[in-house]
């Protein structure tokens, strides 16, 4: 009779195991082991028992005993289990980013790993199990189907392998995958609402909002605003669903024409975008253009108003005749037109808008100088001793310089309050000069003496 | 100076039908002429806008659905599919004018045509 | 665009009261504004424009102020002739997408 001891292991793999083969007969012809496995025979004294050290055990193996004694021969088998944690553990690559609502599936790969009997697979949200199955087939795959909400924002999946061989006297060996971090996010149908300007002018800036409400993690949205090539960069504000991103933009005369503008806002995988047109112009004022800014009394002057090709200008309020960017007036200038303005406004219409520019020039009319009964009368007659003041006013562009001379040498104070006196009395020569010339005027003062009342 | 509106009838939906405008009294190669309409127991709906220089400028809703072109004494209204929801009178208005005080020209429909009916019915 | 809220939507007056309607826009128009008159089976007739001057032939009970982004229809000592619906407009654009009228208001006289 042939016996083995011990009769079941269970042993990590690669490990060793010490096996008796021991036999009931004193003398056996023969006793050994019949095993594919790398063994040493340990000496011991006496015949009816040996001792094996076998080695490197990479599978399960049932290693058997024989003898042959003189009532004939016997065999015993062993049964060796080896036990390993699977190679690999392993949730299937997934978008980071999945969207509220979703189907999301979770795969879970395990390969390796021994005894089968024993392995189980999980799979877990954070400490939460979802799912718990025997771990069949090579390699063994587990799924399971999660709705993604909101709440699940940053949770950390995992798949988790169990060799249980604590019935075997043994320990839970528990093998964990790397965690799969999810991002939930919900992005809106609606496209982000742009309000920007229509239309804006060559060297100014303007001002574009993009905003977007019901997103998740707002945070997280990133913002592209772009018009045309141009790249703004926007200041970003969040509220708890709600983002508003505003930027300056600066256009010059390149980007002259329709330009696209867009708001793109991109979460998760996903992305909305809107479009707007804005159309860039150029329109510099108006010109009024005066033959001459400054001319002499009695001159023909031509006023002109010149502006953008596609504009339609008004000279004065005038209409241009035809209609268009081009308007002007001829006048025969007199002492009345000096100062007078003329204003050019031209409306544009760009993409529909209507814009206004206007520009005015005024009118320099020399002339003069001139001395009338009006301003400076011929005639004085004043009581002795009273109080009066001369006036004698000389009109001109450029104001005249005004002196009155009596006998060429005695002045009449004008605009000066003076007593009069006999002294006063007599025939002046009022003299207005300025570039535009000279003119004279006699100006008589009579003083009346009170023994004449 | 006036405008008047023709060409209005009952169409079965998805029949092309153009509206004309015509304008006496002024030019209209001076003038922005506008389209508006309005349903039955409706508000005022501006429908688009030809230039002086024939840019046209639509509503939103109406893009694709109306075209305005013109000739040198009338402005045309082409409604391209009608549906139902075109039931309406149509109006043409000039829609253009000068303020004396700055010079400025601005849209301001102040000459009104007395409107046509168009029905659209299966 | 230059979105046009025209508040009430409709109103009741006796004869000899007043009537306030406004009008608001979404960006600024200026004084580029206009009030429309319009009764059953007729076009609309212009009342003001420019915000404030009254069209010719129009009585001076209608009055119309406000410039920017606010404006408002004044009428006053109403008369039964002034059952209608009033529109603003706005005179500033035209371009595509835009909306030029406000939505109306009935002004019913008792």
């Known amino acids: 009779q042939t016996s083995v001891s011990p009769s079941k292991v269970i042993l990590p793999r690669g490990g060793s195991v010490l096996v008796t083969c021991s036999t009931s007969c004193d003398q056996p012809k023969l006793l050994g082991i019949e095993t594919p496995l790398p063994k040493k025979e340990l000496l011991l004294p006496g015949n009816n028992r040996k001792v094996y050290e076998l080695s490197n055990v990479q599978e399960d193996s049932q290693p058997m005993c024989y003898s042959n004694c003189p009532d004939g021969q016997s065999t015993a088998k062993t049964f060796l289990t080896v036990y390993w944690t699977p190679e690999r553990v392993e949730l299937a690559p997934l978008p980071s980013w999945q969207p509220v609502g979703k189907n999301l599936t979770l795969r879970c790969q395990v390969e390796g790993g021994a005894p089968r009997a024993n392995l189980t697979v999980v799979l877990l949200r954070g400490e939460k199990e979802l799912k718990r199955e025997p771990a069949v087939g090579e390699p063994a795959e587990v799924t399971t189907t999660v709705l993604v909400r909101r709440d699940h924002h940053g949770a950390n999946f995992s798949c988790r392998t169990e060799l249980d061989l604590r019935p075997q006297g043994l320990e839970l060996f528990e093998n964990t995958s790397a965690p799969y971090q999810l991002q939930t996010f919900v992005l809106p149908a609606t496209p982000p609402q742009l309000v920007s300007p229509r239309v804006l002018e060559v060297d100014t800036q303007g001002t574009v909002v993009c905003s977007l409400d019901g997103l998740f993690p707002v945070s997280e949205a990133q913002v592209h605003l772009a018009l045309g090539d141009q790249r703004l960069n926007p200041t970003v504000t969040y509220g708890n669903d709600s983002f508003s991103a505003k930027a300056s933009v600066s256009v010059t005369a390149e980007d002259e024409g329709t330009q696209r503008l867009t708001c793109a806002v991109i979460l998760g995988n996903q992305s909305q975008e809107t479009l707007q047109t804005v159309t860039i112009y150029s329109f510099p004022a108006p010109n009024v253009i005066l033959t001459k800014p400054e001319v002499s009394e009695g001159t023909e002057v031509t006023v002109k108003c010149e502006a953008h090709p596609r504009a339609k200008v008004t000279l004065n309020g005038v209409p241009a005749q035809p209609l268009g960017p081009r308007a002007q007036l001829l006048l025969k200038a007199t002492p009345e037109d000096n100062g007078r303005s003329f204003s050019c406004s031209a409306t544009l219409e760009v993409a529909g808008q209507l814009i206004h520019k206007n520009q005015t020039r005024e009118l320099r009319v020399l002339y003069g100088p001139r001395l009338d009964e009006r301003d400076c009368p011929g005639n004085w007659t004043w009581p002795e001793n009273s109080q009066q003041t001369p006036m004698c006013q000389a009109w001109g562009n450029p104001l005249p310089e005004l002196k009155c001379l009596k006998d060429g040498t005695f002045p009449l104070p004008i605009g000066e309050s003076v007593t009069v006196t006999r002294d006063l009395e007599g025939t002046y020569l009022c003299r207005a000069r300025s570039t535009q010339g000279e003119v004279t005027r006699k100006v008589t003062v009579n003083v009346l003496s009170p023994r004449y009342e | 100076q006036s405008v008047e509106e023709s060409g209005g009838r009952l169409v079965t939906p998805g029949t092309p039908l153009t509206l004309t405008c015509t304008a006496s009294?002024?030019?209209?190669?001076?003038?922005?002429m506008s389209w508006v309409r309005q349903a039955p127991g409706k508000g005022l709906e501006w429908i688009g806008i030809?230039?002086?220089?024939?840019n046209t400028y639509y509503a939103s809703w109406a893009k694709g659905r109306f075209t305005i072109s013109k000739t040198s004494t009338t402005v045309d209204l082409k409604i391209t599919s009608p549906t139902t929801e075109d039931t309406a009178t149509y109006f043409c208005?000039?829609?253009?004018?000068?303020?004396?005080?700055?010079?400025?020209?601005?849209?301001?429909?102040?000459?009104w045509g007395p409107g046509t009916l168009v029905t659209v019915s299966a | 665009a230059y979105d046009m809220t025209q508040t009430p939507a409709s109103m009741e007056v006796a004869v000899g009261g007043t009537v306030t309607i406004k009008c608001q826009a979404s960006?600024?128009?200026?004084?580029?504004l206009a009030w429309f008159q319009q009764k059953p089976g007729q076009p609309p007739k212009r009342l003001i424009y420019k915000a404030s001057t009254l069209a010719s032939g129009v009585p001076s009970r209608f009055k119309g102020s406000g410039s920017g982004t606010q404006f408002t229809l004044t009428i006053s000592g109403v008369q039964s002739d002034d059952a209608a619906t009033y529109y603003c407009q706005q005179g500033y654009s035209r371009s595509d997408g835009e909306h030029v009228f406000g939505g109306g208001t009935e002004v019913v006289v008792k």
């Open positions: 960006q600024n128009i200026h004084s580029w």
């Open positions: 208005a000039r829609d253009w004018s000068l303020d004396s005080s700055s010079g400025y020209y601005y849209y301001d429909m102040d000459l």
């Open positions: 009294g002024f030019s209209l190669n001076n003038y922005y």
């Open positions: 030809i230039s002086d220089s024939d």
